[in-house]
């Protein structure tokens, strides 16, 4: 199926031009999405093009500026947050990025009633995290790893924790590994629905080994960055969950929530917290060997002022074929009875589906079923459940939004998005207002992205929020590559692939092939989304065919494919890329002497192993910030898929699956190895070890490092990186500059 819908036809073919590398580096063809900042059932905030904060009322059709760009500019604010009582706004400035999600900032509180900034008892700086209570205008914030509470913005703060210490004890914010691999947030505190209680995590990193690397900066001496970072098999952070009554915080102080006995008996993780009511909270825990997860529902005991988690309210989720969950263990969405919930987990056929759990997991009612997967539950109301899946027309790389009417029997299912803009839109997400009165649909492709507003009762489209008209006009004279998504059936495995073809593609000709690979567990590269990026340029201007293949270990096609790589990373992912390449050669339009592979992060690991596979298929390849040994990567991620690097567990495969072990096999390929020296995630150590092994084996290779750059290689490094990789590929494919 051809994915990119035909655009406005231009009769003057000579006015059409190919994409340039400059187009990509300048972000000329980037798109916009519109996610309403919902503040009620029918109102949302949005930052206008001129930086005013505007409140829109869908029902009255009125809008007004609640915060002017002048006020924003007065403190150089780049972000804002309205208090639920609409009396105050926090303004965020001096943004300073830390890790993937975390950053510090300076916060100012603006009083909307008098049009002035709150003076007296100002917030300290820099703050690590700040948020309003869900009701009223209480503030919780984290400063120097401790949590503080303000009843009102102008009040003096109440200090909740006192033991916070840099790189040792983290309160209300995650340490490195929890941020990156478990919570995927910058915060680790959660208000109860009406703001009565505040729950928070305390992470003790005292005994965790530290990764230290040089940050060269501009000074005479480099400084050393130290991060408590547990690598596979190392000592992990110790986590505790506390809850404090924010009305009378000094009364009994923070109360610890007990850990389920079956979890506490060995190393464990806390995976998420979901408030159900002000006096009921749901915690999810995970054994260090991540195939057992326990969901624990805890109730506040007024008489003792403690939290009780009865064993009858513990629900166990266990995988016998792999790890628990997909990338993460799914989180529950509670129904109106405040005890039963909806949750996505594997059904008996090994597909992730929505289940309804009341008393026990064994008695769960399966809500969705089929040889496809439910991906996200967006919202549950009294009569509807909204979720996304890849069911429609059996394309795993699509996302449509569905509504199940749960208020009647039998529950009927309706696809809300399947036929809205079928050619243009096959990959959606959604954002719902309170009680799902209204919702925004954000379509990511395969055509030009579009965001629309809908009535939550009738699903009628109310208005277009963003349709990227400028982008559409800019693309009218661009020769974009053609894209197709198809599948290969190989040995009872379905390999979905996306092929990006030059604009004047002719099947009777031969083209160089570039494989772009990620291939990490529970990832998906073959998606029906719009993108004008580096590989689009390589196809459009340089005449390459680019292919992306989802092999074993990838997501949303059932557990058989997903868990195939369990305890065996680096084997089947590579095999499946190679198998696909052989199939592409059979198609007749690939020049088998000009095949390359490249990937970043996990993709750098797979591309390295593919180059070192000894098949002779690849002429050259690039690895950007690759993992080279699973012993060097984070415990939480690595052990989920590989178990422990111990003799009685999986040490043998840890050793067998390194890139270094295959150094000799790089002799007959051109290899470009790239890494940032300040990569906090996949440490420079990984590439240093590859380089050392290649040198020791006397194998020639090319390398590039990016000083003081992290895993993202952002800013000017991005331009340098893509320019450098382009030269490398053109040289490999004997394409003239």
């Amino acid at each position: 199926i051809v994915l990119r819908p035909p655009r406005v036809h231009n009769s003057e073919e000579n006015t059409m031009r190919a994409l340039t590398l400059k187009d990509i580096l300048n972000g000329t063809f980037s798109y916009k999405t519109f996610f309403p900042n919902w503040i009620s059932g029918q109102e949302y905030l949005h930052q206008s093009a001129d930086n005013n904060i505007v409140l829109y009322n869908i029902e009255t059709g009125q809008s007004y500026t609640i915060l002017s760009n002048r006020t924003m500019k007065s403190v150089n604010a780049s972000n804002y947050g309205l208090s639920p009582d609409r009396q105050f706004v926090y303004l965020e400035s001096d943004y300073s990025k830390l890790w993937r999600y975390s950053y510090t900032a300076t916060y100012y509180i603006y009083d909307l009633s008098n049009g002035e900034f709150v003076r007296g008892n100002e917030l300290p700086r820099p703050i690590q995290y700040l948020c309003w209570s869900p009701v009223g205008s209480k503030l919780a914030y984290v400063y120097q790893n401790n949590i503080y509470l303000k009843q009102r913005p102008g009040d003096p703060p109440f200090q909740i924790t006192f033991n916070g210490r840099e790189n040792k004890i983290f309160n209300g914010i995650p340490d490195w590994v929890y941020e990156e691999e478990m919570l995927a947030t910058k915060y680790a505190l959660w208000w109860s629905p009406n703001g009565k209680f505040l729950a928070y995590a305390e992470f003790n990193d005292t005994d965790i080994p530290v990764i230290a690397y040089s940050y060269y900066g501009d000074e005479q001496y480099p400084r050393t960055i130290n991060i408590p970072y547990p690598k596979a098999g190392a000592k992990n952070p110790f986590v505790r969950i506390f809850i404090i009554d924010t009305t009378y915080p000094a009364y009994v102080g923070p109360q610890e929530v007990p850990v389920p006995a079956m979890i506490a008996s060995s190393d464990y993780y806390f995976s998420w917290l979901t408030w159900v009511t002000d006096e009921r909270v749901c915690l999810q825990w995970l054994k260090r060997v991540q195939n057992v997860s326990v969901l624990s529902i805890c109730d506040f005991r007024e008489d003792w002022q403690t939290w009780d988690c009865p064993k009858t309210q513990e629900h166990i989720e266990e995988s016998r074929t792999g790890w628990a969950g997909g990338f993460f263990v799914s989180t529950p969405v509670f129904s109106y009875d405040a005890i039963s919930y909806y949750k996505i987990f594997s059904d008996k056929d090994g597909y992730k589906h929505i289940h309804y759990i009341k008393d026990t997991v064994e008695n769960a009612i399966q809500i969705t079923s089929g040889k496809w997967e439910a991906i996200n539950i967006f919202r549950v109301t009294q009569d509807s459940l909204f979720y996304s899946s890849n069911e429609f027309e059996d394309y795993p790389g699509r996302r449509n939004i569905y509504r199940i009417s749960i208020g009647s029997y039998p529950p009927s299912k309706k696809c809300v998005t399947c036929h809205l803009r079928k050619e243009r839109c096959q990959y959606y997400t959604a954002s719902f207002s309170d009680y799902a009165k209204y919702y925004a649909l954000v379509c990511y492709g395969p055509g030009i992205p579009i965001s629309t507003l809908h009535d939550g009762r009738t699903d009628q489209e109310i208005k277009i929020l963003e349709e990227n008209k400028e982008l559409e006009n800019a693309l009218k004279n661009i020769q974009l590559p053609k894209e197709e998504i198809k599948k290969l059936e190989v040995d009872e495995i379905t390999l979905w692939y996306k092929m990006i073809l030059p604009p004047q593609f002719d099947r009777s000709k031969k083209y160089p092939l570039l494989i772009q690979v990620y291939g990490g567990p529970c990832s998906q590269s073959v998606r029906s989304v719009f993108a004008v990026n580096w590989i689009s340029y390589l196809a459009s201007k340089e005449g390459m065919v680019i292919a992306l293949v989802d092999g074993r270990g990838t997501a949303f096609q059932g557990d058989k494919l997903l868990y195939a790589v369990y305890r065996k990373l680096g084997v089947y992912e590579v095999e499946d890329q190679i198998t696909a390449v052989r199939k592409f050669i059979e198609m007749g339009f690939i020049d088998e002497k000009r095949i390359a592979i490249w990937g970043w992060s996990y993709g750098g690991y797979v591309s390295s192993l593919a180059l070192a596979s000894g098949t002779g298929l690849f002429k050259c390849g690039i690895a950007v910030a690759p993992v080279s040994s699973w012993e060097y990567y984070a415990s939480v991620y690595t052990e989920r898929f590989m178990g422990l690097p111990t003799k009685d567990d999986n040490l043998e495969h840890y050793k067998n699956s390194t890139v270094m072990a295959r150094a000799e096999y790089f002799r007959n390929v051109d290899y470009l190895l790239i890494h940032g020296t300040a990569d906090d995630n996949v440490h420079f150590q990984n590439s240093a070890q590859i380089a050392k092994a290649l040198v020791n084996a006397q194998v020639d290779f090319q390398a590039m490092w990016y000083s003081d750059q992290n895993h993202g290689l952002s800013g000017l490094s991005t331009n340098h990186l893509y320019t450098h990789m382009t030269h490398f590929l053109k040289q490999c494919f004997s394409l003239s500059d």
């Epitope: 009865p310 009858t312 309210q313 129904s335 109106y336 009875d337 405040a338 005890i339 039963s340 309804y356 009341k358 008393d359 026990t360 008695n363 009612i365 009294q382 009569d383 749960i406 208020g407 009647s408 029997y409 039998p410």
Partner: antibody, heavy 122, light 107 residues
Framework: EVQLLESGGGLVQPGGSLKLSCAAS????????MSWVRQAPGKGLEWIGE????????NYTPSLKDKFIISRDNAKNTLYLQMTKVRPEDTALYYC???????????????WGQGTTVTVSS | ELVMTQSPASLSASVGETVTITCRAS??????LAWYQQKQGKSPQLLVY???TLADGVPSRFSGSGSGTQYSLKINSLQPEDFGSYYC?????????FGGGTKLEIK
């Protein structure tokens, strides 16, 4: 008008078998959860078991699990209770009851039949 | 299996009085509770579900309340037709057991 009509009761010897039926009318039987409940003479109500609309879920009270079988035929609008290995203590008035779907995913016993009497005696 | 303990087993009251029947579960049933009325020689009739929601056609003098393990059925201003037996039943987890019943008689 909703009607549930039990039949098949009578005198049965200990160790014997009996099949009770419950004919439904006046509502969409194929969308209702159905249950059997019994009441021994002068005693309270005892829940026997339930069956969901498409027969994919059938639950019993543990003590009766191995001797009673609940089934349904949606085409015939009929619910069944197969009783085996009966004992004198199974003597009771047997009711079938039908339930509305209630959010979220459970039912209540809104409609009851008039009951059929089973006497177990030698 | 959850045990439902109903009290009192019997009580006598006069027309116009208010009575309360209680039901205690051996574990939390999270409001998944129904109340039934059964008159002599008749089938039971649903009065209340979800612990406090009145079934269709049930007079407003009946009301259900409670949470966790403790629930009650209150009848305000007793009418002659209210006399009979009352049963609670939980719907939390199978088996859906009944309470032992409360016999309400005319004083």
């Amino acid at each position: 008008e909703v009607q549930l009509l039990e039949s098949g009761g009578g005198l049965v010897q200990p160790g014997g078998s009996l099949k009770l039926s419950c004919a439904a009318s006046g509502f969409d039987f194929s969308t209702y959860w159905m249950s059997w409940v019994r009441q021994a003479p002068g005693k309270g109500l005892e829940w026997i078991g339930e069956i969901n609309p498409d027969s994919s879920t059938i639950n019993y009270t543990p003590s009766l699990k191995d001797k009673f079988i609940i089934s349904r035929d949606n085409a015939k609008n009929t619910l069944y209770l197969q009783m085996t290995k009966v004992r004198p203590e199974d003597t009771a008035l047997y009711y079938c009851a039908g339930g509305y779907y209630r959010y979220p995913y459970y039912y209540t016993m809104d409609y009851w039949g008039q009951g059929t009497t089973v006497t177990v005696s030698s | 299996e959850l045990v439902m303990t109903q009290s009192p087993a019997s009580l006598s009251a006069s027309v116009g009085e208010t009575v309360t029947i209680t039901c205690r579960a051996s574990g939390s049933i999270h409001n998944y509770l129904a109340w039934y009325q059964q008159k002599q020689g008749k089938s039971p009739q649903l009065l209340v579900y979800n612990a406090k929601t009145l079934a269709d056609g049930v007079p407003s003098r009946f009301s259900g309340s409670g949470s966790g393990t403790q629930y009650s059925l209150k009848i305000n201003s007793l009418q002659p037709e209210d006399f009979g037996s009352y049963y609670c039943q939980h719907f939390w987890s199978t088996p859906y057991t009944f309470g032992g019943g409360t016999k309400l008689e005319i004083k």
